[in-house]
Interface confidence: medium
Amino acid sequence: RTVPPMVNVTCSEVSEGNITVTCRASSFYPRNITLTWRQDGVSLSHNTQQWGDVLPDGNGTYQTWVATRIRQGEEQRFTCYMEHSGNHGTHPVPSGKVLALQSQW
């Protein structure tokens, strides 16, 4: 069976002018997934991203996340790229108010 992931992109402020963008994939099966941030259409190098483990979410499916830190104002240059079971998609950083929350970094 294949269950496609639900992908959600959120932003949180870490310091003035800097934000962490987090891309979360959830409720997918099987567990193999590619999740990475792209800047200007190109995957970021590994040293500028942080990944969460792929974990069971209790429903027989899995969840994971990837985050990167960017400067406020350059959100439109970034997209989250997802590939799962032959399907792929890109998800933009939402425009609008940034959550003033502590990030996972």
Epitope: N18, S43, S45, T48, E74
Partner: antibody, heavy 121, light 112 residues
Framework: QVQLVESGGGLVKPGGSLRLSCAAS????????MSWIRQAPGKGLEWVSY????????YYADSVKGRFTISRDNAKNSLYLQMNSLRAEDTAVYYC??????????????WGQGTLVTVSS | DIVMTQSPLSLPVTPGEPASISCRSS???????????LYWFLQKPGQSPQILIY???NLASGVPDRFSGSGSGTAFTLKISRVEAEDVGVYYC?????????FGPGTKLEIK
């Protein structure tokens, strides 16, 4: 070995058009972003335009915006620069370069030999 | 746009002696991902430019280790520990932080 070969330069009158090509070999062209850089005779370097691997992200210098169009054909391993409404100040050697900064590598690590565009009446 | 400046614009050096080129940016090139997007290029006479240093202090592949890059967010230095005849040419710094990418005016290194 990586090779970038530009062509299409030449003499053109102000207001005219030219299409530059850059033939790439020795690497997986479709994986890499590309840029055009130019250099006026006896002057410094000026970045002109950028295109992402899939062609979905494109940027231009203000000096060429609305007149130049960057494009690529990944099946032909080729990069293009369509230059319209050319001006005397566009006279320069045009270089194509790879842009690999997101691959744990760096930008502009390979350059072509350049092609000369001369805009004069 | 980020403005890049360099000094000196001309640098006569005796072979075997050290050389230093300064570059400044009108805005910090330190990204929040902790990379500093400053590059150094050398254009030898009659040739295309070649990369020397990427992300401020990293030596590009095949570049002799007599070259080194250092700096902070807005002030950068390219050093050559012992200049050789083959080092002649024009050295450019470039910011790769945001569009449009911008170059410094160049520093011409020549042998005394």
């Amino acid at each position: 070995q990586v090779q970038l070969v530009e062509s299409g330069g030449g003499l053109v009158k102000p207001g005219g058009s030219l299409r530059l090509s850059c033939a790439a070999s020795g690497f997986t062209f479709s994986n890499y972003a590309m840029s055009w850089i130019r250099q006026a005779p006896g002057k410094g370097l000026e970045w002109v335009s950028y295109i992402s691997p899939g062609g979905d992200y494109i940027y231009y210098a203000d000096s060429v915006k609305g007149r130049f169009t960057i494009s690529r054909d990944n099946a032909k391993n080729s990069l293009y620069l369509q230059m319209n409404s050319l001006r005397a100040e566009d006279t320069a050697v045009y270089y194509c370069t790879t842009d690999r900064r997101h691959y744990g590598s760096y930008a502009m690590d390979y350059w072509g030999q350049g092609t000369l565009v001369t805009v004069s009446s | 746009d980020i403005v890049m400046t360099q000094s000196p614009l001309s640098l006569p050096v005796t072979p075997g002696e050290p050389a230093s080129i300064s570059c400044r940016s009108s805005k910090s090139l330190l990204h929040s991902n902790l990379n500093t997007y400053l590059y150094w290029f050398l254009q030898k006479p009659g040739q295309s430019p070649q990369i020397l240093i990427y992300r401020m202090s990293n030596l590009a592949s095949g570049v002799p280790d007599r070259f080194s890059g250092s700096g902070s967010g807005t002030a950068f230095t390219l050093k050559i520990s012992r200049v050789e005849a083959e080092d002649v040419g024009v050295y450019y710094c470039m910011q790769h932080l945001e569009y449009p990418f911008t170059f410094g005016p160049g520093t011409k290194l020549e042998i005394k």
